[in-house]
Interface confidence: low
C-alpha cells in the first residue's frame, strides 16, 4: 500500500507511517514502528504538557516568584501550567502575569469606580456634582455631600469635588 501523506487527528507522520501522539500529561519516549506503539511517559512533578504531542521534554511549571509580588492562583498539574496572580494590592502587568505593579490610587476629586482585581487596575471616575473625595485611595468611592437640611442646618460653604459642604446654624429671625 501507498505510504500515508497525512494522518488522523491525534496522530503524526514519521518514517512514512502514522504514530499516535502522546496524550496531555505525557511526553514521547520513542516513536512507533511497524510492530510497536508510540511509547509515552508521564511528565514528572512540576512538569506539564497541555496538548496531544510528540515532545520529548515536558515543560516546567511556571514559578510564581514572590519577589515579583506573585502568588499561586491555581497549582499546575501534569496537563496544566501553574497560574500565577498578584498579591492583594497589586495587579498583573500582562495577561501572562509575569510580574505585578501597584494598584493605582484615585486622587482627591476622583473616586473608585471599580476596585482593582488580580488582573485589572483600579478604575477611577471624577466625582460628579453633589459628591466628593478628599483622599487618595484605591478603595474609596465618591461620597455624597452632607445634607444640611436633614440636620436642620444651612449650607455655609459649598462643597466641591474634593471637599464636603460645611453646614452651619440657621440665622434666627429677630422678633
Amino acid at each position: 500500500p501507498e505510504p500515508p501523506t497525512a494522518c488522523r487527528e491525534k496522530q503524526y507522520l514519521i518514517n512514512s507511517q502514522c504514530c499516535s501522539l502522546c496524550q496531555p500529561g505525557q511526553k514521547l519516549v520513542s516513536d512507533c514502528t511497524e510492530f510497536t506503539e508510540t511509547e509515552c511517559l508521564p511528565c514528572g512533578e512540576s512538569e506539564f504538557l497541555d496538548t496531544w504531542n510528540r515532545e520529548t521534554h515536558c515543560h516546567q511549571h511556571k514559578y510564581c516568584d514572590p519577589n515579583l509580588g506573585l502568588r499561586v492562583q491555581q497549582k499546575g498539574t501534569s496537563e496544566t501550567d501553574t497560574i500565577c496572580t498578584c498579591e492583594e494590592g497589586w495587579h498583573c502587568t500582562s495577561e501572562a502575569c509575569e510580574s505585578c505593579v501597584l494598584h493605582r490610587s484615585c486622587s482627591p476629586g476622583f473616586g473608585v469606580k471599580q476596585i482593582a482585581t488580580g488582573v485589572s487596575d483600579t478604575i477611577c471616575e471624577p466625582c460628579p456634582v453633589g459628591f466628593f473625595s478628599n483622599v487618595s485611595s484605591a478603595f474609596e468611592k465618591c461620597h455624597p455631600w452632607t445634607s444640611c437640611e436633614t440636620k436642620d442646618l444651612v449650607v455655609q460653604q459649598a462643597g466641591t469635588n474634593k471637599t464636603d459642604v460645611v453646614c452651619g446654624p440657621q440665622d434666627r429671625l429677630r422678633a
Partner: nanobody, 121 residues
C-alpha cells in the same frame, strides 16, 4: 540632582527601637513609591519594605513584618522606618531607595549612602 540622605542609625540592644529617616530632594517625592533595603555584613541587598505614593499601601519582608513600620511625609519629602523589637539579625546598613519600577521590590534607580544599624548587647 536626586539625593537621598538617611539618618537615625546607631547601636541598640536586642529588643530596642530605632527610627530611621530619609530626606529626599531633586525629584517630586510624592510621584514615587519609596522603599527601604538593607545589606548585612558580607551579604547581598535585602528588600525590607515599600510604601505607595500616598502611604495608603505598605508592604514588608516576612523577616520584619509586625516589627517595622514604613511611613512617609510628602509635605516634608521624608521617608521613615520605625524599627521595634530589634534582633541581632537586623544588623545592617539601611538604604532608602526611589522605587522606579513601580514593583514591590523590583528595582530602584537611586539610593542613599546608608545608615548603619547595629543590634548588640
Amino acid at each position: 540632582e536626586v539625593q537621598l540622605l538617611e539618618s537615625g542609625g546607631g547601636l541598640v540592644q536586642p529588643g530596642g527601637s530605632l527610627r530611621l529617616s530619609c530626606a529626599a530632594s531633586g525629584f517630586t517625592f510624592s510621584h514615587y513609591m519609596m522603599m527601604w533595603v538593607r545589606q548585612a555584613p558580607g551579604k547581598g541587598l535585602e528588600w525590607v519594605s515599600t510604601i505607595s505614593h500616598f502611604g495608603d499601601i505598605t508592604y514588608y519582608a516576612d523577616s520584619v513584618k509586625g516589627r517595622f513600620t514604613i511611613s512617609r511625609d510628602n509635605s516634608k519629602n521624608t521617608l521613615y522606618l520605625q524599627m521595634n523589637s530589634l534582633r541581632a539579625e537586623d544588623t545592617a546598613v539601611y538604604y532608602c531607595a526611589k522605587n522606579d519600577m513601580v514593583m514591590k521590590n523590583g528595582g530602584f534607580d537611586y539610593w542613599g549612602q546608608g545608615t548603619l544599624v547595629t543590634v548588640s548587647s
